[in-house]
Interface confidence: low
């Protein structure tokens, strides 16, 4: 086996093992290899009522505990720390041991904090742009001062991978600290459902803490997408509201956002993914504009980039006709009219071109029958001209 | 420097209602959903609540719905989280969280405050 560091725990009983004004504080030395390690207490000022008991071998790893009884009341007015040293692996940890005092009947016993791991997905809108870069963020919360640094594993498919870019630990106001470790991921990993594992490993930990995620399983569905204009009985209002309705998609992960003639819009905002009774997701965004600028006629275009959708992207526009004020319930009806209107527009394209052809090639028939004309009536009439030059007196 | 100030905890009857202030500070409060996640003794973290930017979509764990309302003033950066019907597992320490932007807000927070605690007597 290879040289291992002990993960070193606090042991701190409740009430129960307060006796006889004493309390029996604990160290656990876990998972080192090889022997020896040395335990101490308080840097060795602490030497009566010591217990250091035999190391056990256990898979390779040895495990070892130690024990210090201090006087429970008076509390003490050190603290009491153990200090484990593994020459082996130049390991040296000193751990702080607060006894939980659980003696009065009124209190509430507030176990000391474990740390808590989450793990994100990457934001859709990195996973569906090819020149962003997708991330699975890897958080642990609540890690105490004392704690030693949190180390952070990476596996992709259940193999380990080291691109993972971990920050310092950061303090939090509340005196906590917080750790985060990202792992930049391939985008058609993450859309083909690969698995991102993050373990979290710390001397603080009973054991590593492994959270996993990976994209929602299922088949794909493309969103509808739909825009709306503003309510004719808004229009009184200095604000409008422009409504992009996205429909029937799934997975929930999707990107809707806003075009202000070309530019990104940000007066925006977007319901979270509502689940149909279909097991499919719907969206509303709503953008508010000024009523003046819907009227001067400017375009808003709806833009929902979404994995099941052809490129991944699709956009739908929006503009004030002025002149044309139509109500909701002609909106079917207008659709059919401006279906009609491009039939009408094709048709005439079309015939007119057809036309324009018609003519080119009549005419050409014409240019090329009437210079054929000519060149035959030349050639009949140049021999006249040359007997009419030899005839002159 | 992000901050979350959580007060409003206490002693309370079971039956008996509490609200509790989050005051946030040293972000665009506005920009971020939040969340109520507690703890009681002796157990690991529990997520109770959470609102999006606008405050018009929340959703509750199984074992508050219905009494908890989780509620927010974007105007003032607070974050509330009113409780009703108390019983005696509510006891806990309830912090209110900020929720990453890379997130699903189902799924924890980056920051956090210190904690009020609601104990609810039987």
């Known amino acids: 086996a290879k040289t291992t560091p002990p993960s070193v725990y606090p042991l701190a009983p409740g009430s129960a093992a307060q006796t006889n004004s004493m309390v029996t504080l604990g160290c656990l030395v876990k998972g080192y290899f090889p022997e020896p390690v040395t335990v101490t207490w308080n840097s060795g000022s602490l030497s009566s009522g010591v217990h250091t008991f035999p190391a056990v071998l256990q898979s390779d790893l040895y495990t070892l505990s130690s024990s210090v009884t201090v006087p429970s009341s008076p509390r003490p007015s050190e603290t009491v720390t153990c200090n484990v040293a593994h020459p082996a692996s130049s390991t040296k940890v000193d751990k702080k041991i607060v006894p939980r005092d659980c003696g009065c009947k009124p209190c509430i016993c507030t176990v000391p904090e474990v740390s808590s791991v989450f793990i994100f997905p990457p934001k859709p809108k990195d996973v569906l742009t090819i020149t962003l870069t997708p991330k699975v963020t890897c958080v642990v919360v609540d890690i105490s001062k004392d704690d030693p640094e949190v180390q952070f594993s990476w596996f992709v498919d259940d193999v380990e991978v080291h691109t993972a870019q971990t920050q310092p630990r950061e303090e939090q106001f509340n005196s906590t600290f917080r750790s985060v470790s990202e792992l930049p991921i391939m985008h058609q990993d993450w859309l083909n459902g690969k698995e991102f594992k993050c373990r979290v490993n710390s001397a603080a930990f009973p054991a590593p803490i492994e959270k996993t995620i990976s994209k929602t399983k299922g088949r794909p569905k493309a969103p509808q997408v739909y825009t709306i204009p503003p309510p004719k009985e808004q229009m009184a209002k200095d604000k409008v509201s422009l409504t992009c309705m996205i429909t029937d998609f799934f997975p929930e992960d999707i990107t809707v956002e806003w075009q202000w003639n070309g530019q990104p819009a940000e007066n925006y905002k977007n319901t979270q993914p509502i689940m149909n009774t279909n097991g499919s997701y719907f969206v509303y965004s709503k953008l508010n504009v000024q009523k003046s600028n819907w009227e001067a006629g400017n375009t808003f275009t709806c833009s929902v980039l979404h994995e099941g959708l052809h490129n991944h992207h699709t956009e739908k526009s929006l503009s004030h006709s002025p002149g044309l004020q139509l109500d909701e319930t002609c909106a079917e009806a207008q659709d059919g009219e401006l279906d009609g209107l491009w039939t009408t527009i094709t048709i005439f394209i079309s015939l007119f071109l057809l036309s324009v052809c018609y003519s080119a090639a009549v005419t050409l028939f014409k240019v090329k029958w009437i210079f054929s004309s000519v060149v035959e009536l030349k050639q009949t009439l140049v021999p006249e001209y040359k007997n009419m030059i030899g005839q002159a007196p | 420097q992000v901050q979350l100030v959580e007060s409003g905890g206490g002693l309370v009857q079971a039956g008996g209602s509490v609200r509790l202030s989050c005051a946030a500070s040293?972000?665009?409060?506005?920009?971020?959903?939040m969340t109520w996640v507690r703890q009681a003794p002796g157990k690991g973290p529990e997520w109770v609540s959470a609102?999006?930017?606008?405050?018009?979509?929340?959703r509750y764990a199984e074992s508050v719905k219905g009494r908890f309302t989780i509620s927010r003033d974007n105007a003032k950066n607070m974050l509330y989280l009113q409780m009703n019907s108390l019983k005696p597992e509510d006891t806990a320490l309830y912090y209110c969280?900020?929720?990453?932007?890379?997130?699903?807000?189902?799924?924890?927070?980056?920051?956090r405050g210190q904690g009020t605690l609601v104990t609810v007597s039987s």
């Open positions: 609102i999006n930017t606008g405050g018009d979509a929340t």
């Open positions: 969280g900020r929720v990453p932007g890379y997130s699903d807000y189902r799924q924890g927070y980056d920051y």
């Open positions: 040293g972000f665009t409060f506005s920009s971020y959903y």
